[in-house]
């Protein structure tokens, strides 16, 4: 039956988010084939007439590629043979958000899976002691967020406490007039405590922790993309 065989193959995608102005990865894996020349990968986007990307017979085939993706896409050619059809996307834009389809043909059959791709801006926060302030104050800064996130402070000692009355958050538009710098200040902090600054929008959640003791300051931060579910 060759590539026109009746069988369907398993194709798996993972919903993901792209950070605007950076590289993005649209993840897709499939049951591998032993011959690269028998594998066809097509990436499509809902509402877009041309293809996002096509890879067949061991190389990119871009004659049907939509202009909005020209020069912005590539598969990991050396990993296709092991079942990786993921797509690298250059300079992610807000308009790249949407539903993508990863469509695969191999000698074993064909299959496809959809992927929801969100776009925005997210960055790691950094929490520092603000020595310029008159009282014990913490300052949480994150350089790039979009859409506008919420900022919540928490403390290890005062779990469940509401810090909205003793904190002040501002959003400053960056020079490109899209993303914003997030600055949040927490007042009246106590020593020997760990404070967390949590920044969240519908794309990502980031946390910056600071532990202040008599002798040292320890910092830690992490970022998690939301809605990363496989399909």
């Amino acid at each position: 039956f060759g590539i026109s065989g009746r069988h369907s193959i398993t194709v798996t995608t993972v919903a993901s988010a792209g950070n605007i102005g950076e590289d993005g990865i649209l993840s897709c894996t499939f049951e591998p084939d032993i011959k690269l020349s028998d594998i066809v990968i097509q990436w499509l986007k809902e509402g877009v007439i041309g293809l996002v990307h096509e890879f067949k017979e061991g190389k990119d085939e871009l004659s049907e590629q939509d202009e909005m993706f020209r020069g912005r896409t590539a598969v990991f050619a050396d990993q296709v043979i092991v079942g990786n059809a993921s797509l690298r996307l250059k300079n992610v834009q807000l308009t790249d958000a949407g539903t993508y389809k990863c469509y695969i043909i191999t000698s074993k059959g064909k299959g496809n899976a959809n992927l929801e791709y969100k776009t925005g801006a997210f960055s790691m926060p950094e929490v520092n002691v603000d020595y310029n302030a008159s009282s014990e104050t913490l300052r949480c800064e994150a350089p790039r967020w979009f859409p506008q996130p919420t900022v919540v402070w928490a403390s290890q000692v005062d779990q469940g406490a509401n810090f909205s009355e003793v904190s002040n958050t501002s959003f400053e538009l960056n020079s490109e007039n899209v993303t914003m710098k997030v600055v949040s200040v927490l007042y009246n902090v106590t020593i020997n405590n760990t404070y967390s600054c949590m920044i969240e929008n519908d794309i990502a959640k980031a946390t910056g922790d600071i532990k202040v003791t008599e002798s040292e300051i320890k910092r830690r931060s992490h970022l998690q993309l939301l809605n990363s579910k496989a399909s």
Epitope: D60, L62, R70, G71, T73, A74, E176
Partner: antibody, heavy 121, light 107 residues
Framework: EVQLVQSGAEVKKPGASVKVSCKAS????????IGWVRQAPGQGLEWIGD????????NYNEKFKGRATITRDTSTSTAYLELSSLRSEDTAVYYC??????????????WGQGTLVTVSS | DIQMTQSPSSLSASVGDRVTITCKAS??????VAWYQQKPGKAPKLLIY???TLQPGVPSRFSGSGSGRDYTLTISSLQPEDFATYYC?????????FGQGTKVEIK
Amino acid sequence: EVQLVQSGAEVKKPGASVKVSCKASGYTFTSYWIGWVRQAPGQGLEWIGDIYPGGGYTNYNEKFKGRATITRDTSTSTAYLELSSLRSEDTAVYYCARLDGSSYRGAMDSWGQGTLVTVSS
Amino acid sequence: DIQMTQSPSSLSASVGDRVTITCKASQGFNKYVAWYQQKPGKAPKLLIYYTSTLQPGVPSRFSGSGSGRDYTLTISSLQPEDFATYYCLQYGNLLYAFGQGTKVEIK
């Protein structure tokens, strides 16, 4: 090893055209964009445009649109830059360069040796 | 079109000095900034791409940083072979653009 070998120096009269070639080897020619950059004597680098040999798609600096034509011959793995209506200000070293990232247009990571084009009456 | 404004246009430094060169994009924002080194009569050489990724084989004294519209190339300890002209390149958009160049000379 990626290699880009350019054609030799040219002397042209104002109003004439010049065609510079760039022969690629050491990689799959049709899978990577090739760009053209020029440098006038004592001046900086100026991006002219680029081509994706796999499909012949091109991009041009607005300044050169209508005067520069970038083409390729996949059978010989060669890219070409043709510049018409030459003037003295076009006297420069013309470089071809491979763009990193295959079908993804990356930075220029491998360069030809350059071709000096002199425009003089 | 995006323009890249590079500064300074030239600088004098000594071996061992820390050197910083900056490029400012006229608009937009993305991480697609590369840095090149060029010596007289030679083709440019890629040092750094995607703001801060060092090209294989390039010494670690070269580093890149930046975000938004402002980007920086730093040479932590200038070596004799580093005296050259440096260019930034914006390659995120359809139209690429180089900075005007910075000539690093011996003091």
